[in-house]
Interface confidence: low
């Protein structure tokens, strides 16, 4: 005999008691699959969370992070607080990056500036708490006779690509 | 305020299609379902089928799985129901209407004649 | 299909009246059941869900009651603008059924 929960569509539950009728899910409630013999209880974004997608009977609520807060994990399951760029969150709060890292972000940890040397580079731009150094050409390109008719091409902020 | 709006009218040809409109506005459409309700003249209402514009889940009435076609466009706020093979019998007022289980807001109604 | 049998199929009242629609499911539906109104060339507006539970916007004589299997829909002090069909409607599973409707007329 076919089980008849299968049939049961997502926002529904196959309630057993009623002779495996497809009930739709109660308040504040969901199923996203069909077949399902219980609904869930949908998600509630409160203190520090925000609704970014109220529950439907088909899908759970999704939650944000309140200004000054940024989402951690899978589905947004906490909230961090936010720093200025040029500062790392730590135990004791905010604290301003040390001379030779960088943070560009309201999130994440300060990271070192980039060794230009290593590529036989110079510095162009000196780096600060909230941006990277900005590598020019190598000392041997700009010595006398060398050719500087193409001026480096500006630096680039991290997550913007060219036009 | 939301509104529900609906072409007042649509005349057909037996044998044809047609693909009526149902654009939503004042509230998020991608949040409610839209369902779609028939009226024949001097009859009662039957629910067709409805529409989860979030994920595009759809339940059908039995009767209705091989006439009518249930669409969203969620760039427009627009529900669609597309009825094919056309008779006499499909002449009736459509409804759409906003609800998960009450139907809390309904469409005017188009006015669906079938006829050569 | 559950179906939903309302009765009787017309209502005659006198303004000022108290009137009662009955919609008896074929199974028991606990609390799921909507009541709607439908006035001449007009849509129909929802006028009590979950058996009982009133809507902001209508008026306080609308009332419902009922579980199980049996429904009633009330109008306290009927009105002339209350001439409408009146529909109950099942959420307990699909698809979605609709009762046969009562027409409510003026004396």
């Known amino acids: 005999l076919q089980d008849l929960c299968s049939n049961c569509p997502a926002g529904t539950f196959c309630d057993n008691n009623r002779s495996q009728i497809c009930s739709p899910c109660p308040p504040n409630s969901f199923s996203s699959a069909g077949g399902q013999r219980t609904c869930d209880i949908c998600r509630q974004c409160k203190g520090v969370f925000k609704t970014r997608k109220e529950c439907s009977s088909t899908s759970n609520a999704e939650c944000d992070c309140i200004s000054g807060y940024h989402c951690l994990g899978a589905e947004c399951s906490m909230c961090e607080q936010d720093c200025k760029q040029g500062q790392e969150l730590t135990k004791k709060g905010c604290k301003d990056c040390c001379f030779g890292t960088f943070n560009d972000q309201k999130r994440g940890i300060c990271r070192p500036w980039t060794n230009c040397s290593l590529d036989g580079k110079s510095v162009l731009v000196n780096g600060t708490k909230e941006r990277d150094v900005v590598c020019g050409p190598s000392p041997a390109d700009l010595s006398p006779g060398a050719s500087s008719a193409t001026p480096p091409a500006p630096a680039r902020e991290p997550g913007h690509s060219p036009q | 305020q939301v509104q529900l709006q609906q072409p007042g009218a649509e005349l057909v040809k037996p044998g044809a299609s047609v693909k009526l409109s149902c654009k939503a506005s004042g509230y998020t459409f991608t949040n409610f379902w839209i369902n779609w309700v028939k009226q024949r003249p001097g009859q009662g209402l039957e629910w067709i089928g409805n529409?989860?514009?979030?994920?595009?889940?759809?339940n059908y009435n039995e009767r209705f799985k091989t006439k009518a076609t249930l669409t969203v466009d969620i760039s427009s706020s627009t529900a669609y129901m597309r009825l094919s093979s056309l008779t006499s019998e499909d002449s009736a007022v459509y409804y759409c209407a906003r609800g998960q289980l009450g139907l809390d807001y309904w469409g005017q109604g188009t006015t669906l004649t079938v006829s050569s | 299909d559950i179906l939903l049998t309302q009765s009787p199929a017309i209502l005659s009242v006198s303004p000022g009246e108290r009137v009662s629609f009955s919609c008896r499911a074929s199974?028991?539906?606990?609390?799921?059941i909507q009541w709607y109104q439908q006035r001449t060339n007009g849509s129909p507006r929802l006028l009590i869900k979950y058996a009982s539970e009133s809507l902001s916007g209508i008026p306080s004589r609308f009332s419902g009651s009922g579980s199980g299997t049996d429904f009633t829909l009330s109008i306290n002090n009927v009105e002339s603008e209350d001439i409408a069909d009146y529909y109950c409607?099942?959420?307990?599973?699909?698809?979605?059924?609709f009762g046969s409707g009562t027409k409510l007329e003026i004396k």
């Open positions: 529409i989860y514009p979030g994920n595009t889940g759809t």
């Open positions: 199974q028991i539906i606990g609390t799921t």
């Open positions: 409607q099942q959420s307990h599973s699909w698809p979605f059924t």
